[in-house]
């Protein structure tokens, strides 16, 4: 779980000729507000498809009245960030739509009128926890400058917000292989329970034994990049075997369609398929009415028979916002006790409890580790009402008192031989395989999208797994 944050820096005329007319006038003062819609992945989706990652609406900006004869300046902006909470993993790649709306404050019958001034869209890669990313997008003669970032909500950490933190069981340090949880330095990363071998960088899980891939990665353990090396055709995807994408030159390169329109090639040129509310050769003309379906999530549109009159969205249960774009956050009721993480699954609320607590609302305190000692540097792990020791490398058993054979679990795949080593284990791979655990086949034609052997290491050489 986490939050995507968007900071609008400026909205005004773009560089070059053809400055846009000011959206407000002395007769019709107005103010701006913004809407952001997020979708996971890099796929081209229609503008009206659901904002599966979430959506948010800004506050209204200050009232602005055009000064007669003056060019349209950067318009006054609403205060604060736009925040889009996400409850699942951050996907790493995402599509966004940012809309600039005008609220006219003249003497309209029935209250203020809204109209869409500009819509920009794009696709980006972004790791959670990283710095603010800056961007500039143009829509017709308008230019929007903004920054964005994704951050995890405690106790989630990591680039996908899928690793969890838990309180330290020992005051001085975290257990073997577990790092302190920045910025919660008094907590430690909880050990991952994903499918054995699932890539910690490119895979994630929400259930024990799962391995689900972030966009751009594939394979059962999410270790294979979605690559272009094995594509068969010179243009377009050959995803049946590799999931790869090859962009090629063509009239749709750079997408000449504005406002989230999708481009398709024609024998002579290109054709834009425009999202609702836009039309024109390049989807550059806008004007939203009830006929354009501005209400999301099944909201009922009332009024707004023409672009200059207002419409109102009546939202179904569970949604709110002027366009029904916001899901009601039932987790704001804070049902989970003792620092439990609330998950709104749509059909039910669930609490993911911190270590040491259990029950549907994390109301039961389990003091499993009190008075328990794990030998040889092991760490006591609470859970399920029975203490368990997470043992340091080379030790095993209930209290970490037994010497462990690192090869007992047969970690070397594809017939590789395992050798115990003072710093861990070493796999000697069978011919045709390589990798720390012999997990990668060596394709003789060199067309594999898998990582090559490190320099100086031949397939079949023993590889140390630390």
């Amino acid at each position: 779980a986490g939050v995507f944050e968007l900071q609008i820096h400026s909205f005004g005329p773009g560089p070059g000729p053809g400055a846009p007319r000011s959206p407000c006038s002395a007769r019709l003062p107005c103010r701006l507000f913004f809407r952001v819609c997020l979708k996971p992945g890099l796929s081209e989706e229609a503008a009206e498809s659901p904002c599966a990652l979430g959506a948010a609406l800004s506050a209204r900006g200050p009232v602005y009245t055009e000064q007669p004869g003056a060019p349209a300046p950067d318009l006054p902006l609403p205060d604060g960030l736009l925040q889009v909470p996400f409850r699942d993993a951050w996907p790493g790649t995402f599509s966004f739509i940012i809309e600039t709306w005008r609220e006219e404050l003249g003497d309209q019958i029935g209250g203020p009128a809204w109209s869409l001034l500009a819509r920009v869209a794009g696709r980006r890669r972004l790791a959670a926890g990283g710095p603010w990313a800056r961007d500039i997008q143009r829509a017709g003669a308008w230019e929007l400058r903004f920054s964005y970032r994704a951050r995890c909500e405690p106790p989630a950490v990591g680039t996908a917000c899928t690793r969890l933190c838990r309180p330290r069981s020992a005051p001085s340090r975290c257990g073997p292989g577990l790092r302190p949880c920045a910025p919660l330095e008094d907590e430690c990363e909880a050990p991952l329970v994903c499918r054995a071998g699932c890539s910690p960088e490119h895979g994630f899980c929400e259930q024990p034994g799962e391995c689900r891939c972030l966009e751009g990665w594939t394979g059962p353990l999410c270790t294979v990049p979605v690559s272009t090396s094995s594509c068969l055709s010179p243009r377009g995807p050959s995803s049946a075997t590799t999931g790869c994408l090859v962009p090629g030159p063509g009239p749709c390169d750079g997408n000449p369609c504005a406002n989230g329109g999708s481009c398709s090639e024609t024998p002579r040129s290109f054709e834009c398929t425009c999202p609702r509310g836009f039309y024109g050769l390049r989807c550059e003309v806008s004007g939203v009415t009830c006929a354009d379906g501005p209400c999301f999530n099944g909201g009922l549109c009332v009024g707004g028979a023409d672009p200059d009159s207002a419409y109102i969205c009546h939202c179904p249960p569970g949604f709110q916002g002027s366009n029904c774009e916001k899901r009601v956050d039932r987790c704001s009721l804070q049902p989970c006790r003792n620092g439990g993480l609330c998950l709104d699954l749509g059909h039910a609320l669930r609490c993911r409890c911190r270590a040491g607590f259990a029950g549907p609302r994390c109301e039961h305190d389990l003091d499993d580790c009190a008075g328990r000692a794990c030998a040889n540097g092991g760490t006591c792990v609470e859970g399920g009402g029975a203490h368990r020791c997470s043992c340091a490398l080379g030790f095993g058993g209930r209290d970490c008192r037994e010497r462990a054979d690192p090869c007992a679990a047969r970690p070397c795949a594809h017939g590789g031989r395992c050798y115990a080593h003072f710093s861990g284990l070493v796999c000697a791979c069978a011919p045709g395989y390589m990798g720390a655990r012999c997990e990668f086949p060596v394709h003789p034609d060199g067309a594999s999208a898998l990582p090559a052997a490190p320099p100086g290491l031949r397939p079949g050489d023993p590889q140390r797994y630390l």
Partner: antibody, heavy 113, light 112 residues
Framework: SLEESGGRLVTPGTPLTLTCTAS????????MIWVRQAPGKGLEWIGI?????STYYASWAKGRFTISRTSTTVDLKATSLTTEDTATYFC???????????WGPGTLVTVSS | DVVMTQTPSSVSAAVGGTVTINCQSS????????LAWYQQKPGQPPKLLIY???TLASGVPSRFKGSGSGTQFTLTISDLECDDAATYYC????????????FGGGTEVVVK
Amino acid sequence: SLEESGGRLVTPGTPLTLTCTASGFSLNTYHMIWVRQAPGKGLEWIGIVDSGGSTYYASWAKGRFTISRTSTTVDLKATSLTTEDTATYFCARGGSWDGFNIWGPGTLVTVSS
Amino acid sequence: DVVMTQTPSSVSAAVGGTVTINCQSSQSVYNSDFLAWYQQKPGQPPKLLIYAASTLASGVPSRFKGSGSGTQFTLTISDLECDDAATYYCQGTYEDVGWFNDFGGGTEVVVK
């Protein structure tokens, strides 16, 4: 839950699209497979769209079937059906490639002249 | 192409007894352990029993046990109950040019 739709009686050579619709969760971060079962026969794997968006197909299904995904649906498009394609078609959700724990009830496709 | 052979095709045992189903693959499954077992009853979709060769799926009783690695796998059902009468399938994950799954031919379990 998952539910397949689009199954019907068609004539040979007809294209057909089956849709798997999810309720209660988003499909974007799960592996989704299509499997079929001819009457009185065993399960036959058609293909998968993994959580990263890549698609893979059984060797016999390449070129005959296409899988695509949105956040709430996964489609299986058949280009040209034959009588051997008569079967119940299932979609299933998995968190890993070898554990598909949520299945739809299936939709019956009958190909007959 | 990979061939997954399930034996026997049909097995009968009494309530309280034990049955063993074998699944043999013509090539090693991915990572030696990407193998799952499913139970299917007439008119119903399959139900996941075991994944990762030996890990019990949520809500599945411990009477079901999976074992094996590489190309040879076994599903053992002990303390048979009438409700266990069904067809059981193994499913392997393999690596080729891309990735793919394959199912075994199925084993019908009859409980007397």
